[in-house]
């Protein structure tokens, strides 16, 4: 049969609230060298136990009896500390355990989860979470909105999750946890009501360097909108935007619009250029979320200046004219040049030269026409740019280089008939 247990004092019981500090103690009387005392919790050896062992000899001889006291300190009681505690010793070839002591947790409810501050769009549903535990159980929750209970009694309304169908003003929420020991109140969460995201961002009109855009504001609760902010970003390499990247790849052009009206003219843009635009509206509570990026494009414009460095020389019945691309912005894709020449008493001749920057003209009458002048204009798909000032044909002097060009015979009647709007900026000479 088993030897008698050496334990003369067993661990007591501890029951308290979270954070409590307590000590479990066991005592044994042994003959000979005192053993090391181990502590078990629910059958498991506590490897990092905060324990102290005191040994007192009862006689002069080492082989006399010893009193051994082991104390286990629980510094801040948590749920994980609860359970059955025993002392364990190995004596010779036998194992002894003390009678068990119990550590229990009992106090005010303890929050595992509390409502968090957040922002929500006006009139938009959201959920808040709150979770508490004892012991003792059960723990019943009571939600409060702006310090007003949302149910008649704890446990009667929503529990772990509160569904709010929408708010029109910034509000505070908290939850109370009730158990047999009393009530604990959670932190107070502030739910800030922001304007809803604007809708239906669209183009009203387009000019080569400006776009007029409009949108429909979202609801903003009891807080009027103070302004809306529009951002535009060049999107020639803006792959990130199309892929739904939240931030543009470069610094956006930002404009503020007073509201109403929910409309804004964006100026100083590049012609014939793709942009992405988005809008957010702000109330005293803060800004709405941005709309999705909307791809837009400025239209082409006409060139803003005439071709440069026009020179025109004449040698008998031939005239050689050449020029350079306008220095002024083209505002689109250059499609070509138009050339007009005219003598003192002869009708104007209009020609489309295409993208070449030089032409040799075959003049009629072997140069008998006097005071011949030439004008050149660049054009895009949007129309003609301004015509150059008339350039008189100079007589060719020997020694001047005369490039060989494809000859263009002067037609007897103008080769082209122009729609009227192409003539409006032609300054006649």
């Amino acid at each position: 049969q088993a030897e008698e247990s050496p334990f003369v004092g067993n661990p007591g019981n501890i029951t308290g609230a979270r954070g409590l500090t307590g000590t479990l103690r066991c005592q044994l009387q042994v003959q000979g060298e005192p053993p090391e005392v181990h502590w078990l919790r629910d059958g498991q050896i506590l490897e990092l136990a905060d324990s102290t062992q005191t040994q007192v000899p009862l006689g002069e001889d080492e082989q006399d009896d010893w009193i051994v006291v082991s104390q286990l300190r629980i510094t801040s009681l948590q749920l994980s500390d609860t359970g059955q505690y025993q002392c364990l010793v190995f004596l010779g070839h036998q194992t002894f355990v003390s009678q068990p002591g119990y550590v229990g947790l009992e106090g005010l409810p303890y929050f595992l989860e509390e409502p968090e501050d957040r922002t929500v769009a006006a009139n938009t549903p959201f959920n808040l979470s709150c979770q508490a535990q004892g012991p003792p159980e059960p723990v019943d929750l009571l939600w409060l909105q702006d310090a007003v209970p949302l149910a008649t009694a704890p446990g009667h309304g929503p529990q772990r999750s509160l569904h709010v169908p929408g708010l029109n003003k910034t509000s505070s929420f908290s939850c109370e946890a009730h158990n047999a020991k009393g009530v604990t109140t959670s932190r107070t969460a502030t739910i800030t009501v922001l304007p809803q995201q604007p809708r239906n961002l669209h183009l009203v009109s387009r000019q080569p360097t400006e776009l007029e855009v409009a949108w429909t504001p979202g609801l903003s609760g009891i807080y009027p909108l103070t302004h809306c902010t529009l951002q535009a970003v060049l999107s020639d390499d803006g792959m990130g935007i199309q892929a739904g990247e939240p931030d543009p790849p470069e610094e956006p052009l930002t404009s503020q619009a007073s509201v109403p009206p929910h409309q804004l003219r964006l100026g100083s843009l590049h012609p014939h250029t793709p942009y992405h635009i988005r809008v957010a509206c702000t109330s005293s509570q803060g800004p709405s979320s941005w709309t999705h990026w909307l791809p837009v494009e400025t239209p082409e414009g006409v060139p803003l200046g005439p071709p440069e460095n026009i020179s025109a020389t004449r040698n008998g019945s031939q005239a050689f004219v050449h020029w350079q691309e306008p220095r002024a912005p083209l505002q689109g894709t250059l499609l070509g040049y138009r050339l007009a020449y005219q003598g003192q008493d002869t009708p104007e001749v209009l020609m489309d030269i295409g993208l070449r920057q030089e032409v040799t003209l075959e003049l009629q009458g072997d140069g008998s026409v006097s005071n011949l002048t030439v004008c050149v204009a660049a054009y895009t798909a949007a129309g003609d740019g301004p015509w150059s000032l008339p350039v008189p044909l100079e007589a060719w002097r020997p020694g001047q280089a005369q490039p060989v060009h494809q000859l263009v015979k002067e037609p007897s009647t103008p080769a082209f008939s122009w729609p009227h709007h192409h003539h409006h900026h032609h300054h006649h000479h």
Epitope: A2, G43, Q44, I45, L48, Q84, L88, V97, Q99, P100
Partner: antibody, heavy 116, light 106 residues
């Protein structure tokens, strides 16, 4: 000396339950935990749970929760393990083992065969 | 749960040889325990609290280690040591065992 003696082999059909007993002697039965560990043919050891005979408190491995029940009868120093809804992969030798933070004494094992 | 991995899985050795079995834990543990299981027998405790010899275990067996790496050493192997050896931890629940190392005597 400490001894743990288990009940004999069992053959069960899938879906049935089996109850294995473990009789302790040679030490104060109510002071030490009784654990149950199983070993499938040619396999390693798997802990199923424990019972503290002094109080009847139990702790089960999550894997077996809902299917295992451990009980004891202190008057005859015997612990029991019942496993329900048996499946063919429950075929194993089931051991009871006394524990003091580890398994210092083992029963001889009970072979449970689950076969249709 | 903590996973224990033993090495080697199998070893064939001659008597009088020194044998080392290692056990690696997936997380740091405080103590390791070792068991011996012979064919058709139940496991038997060899080493407790990492390095303490259980009652009746020959002194040729020893244990050591800390953290995640533990070792069982058999100093001068005898024929009766042919068995499967298991390491075990109970630093965290559930207690787990290594997959076993089978020792064969040549």
């Amino acid at each position: 000396q400490v001894q743990l003696v288990q009940s004999g082999a069992e053959v069960k059909k899938p879906g049935a339950s089996v109850k294995v007993s473990c009789k302790a002697s040679g030490y104060p039965f109510t002071d030490f935990y009784i654990n149950w560990v199983r070993q499938a043919p040619g396999q390693g050891l798997e802990w199923m749970g424990w019972i503290y005979p002094g109080s009847g408190n139990t702790k089960y491995n999550e894997k077996f929760k809902g299917r295992v029940t451990m009980t004891r009868d202190t008057s005859i120093s015997t612990a029991y393990m019942e496993l329900s809804r048996l499946r063919s992969d429950d075929t194993a030798v089931y051991y009871c083992a006394r524990s003091t933070g580890f398994f210092d004494y083992w029963g001889q094992g009970t072979l449970v065969t689950v076969s249709s | 749960e903590i996973v224990l991995t033993q090495s080697p899985d199998f070893q064939s050795v001659t008597p009088k040889e020194k044998v080392t079995i290692t056990c690696s834990a997936s997380s740091s543990i405080g103590y390791m325990y070792w068991y011996q299981q012979k064919p058709d027998q139940s496991p038997k405790l060899l080493i407790y609290l990492t390095s303490n010899l259980a009652s009746g275990v020959p002194s040729r067996f020893s244990g050591s280690g800390s953290g995640t790496d533990y070792t069982l050493t058999i100093n001068s192997l005898e024929a009766e040591d042919a068995a499967t050896y298991y390491c075990q931890q109970w630093s965290s629940n559930p207690p787990t065992f290594g997959q076993g190392t089978k020792l064969e005597i040549k």
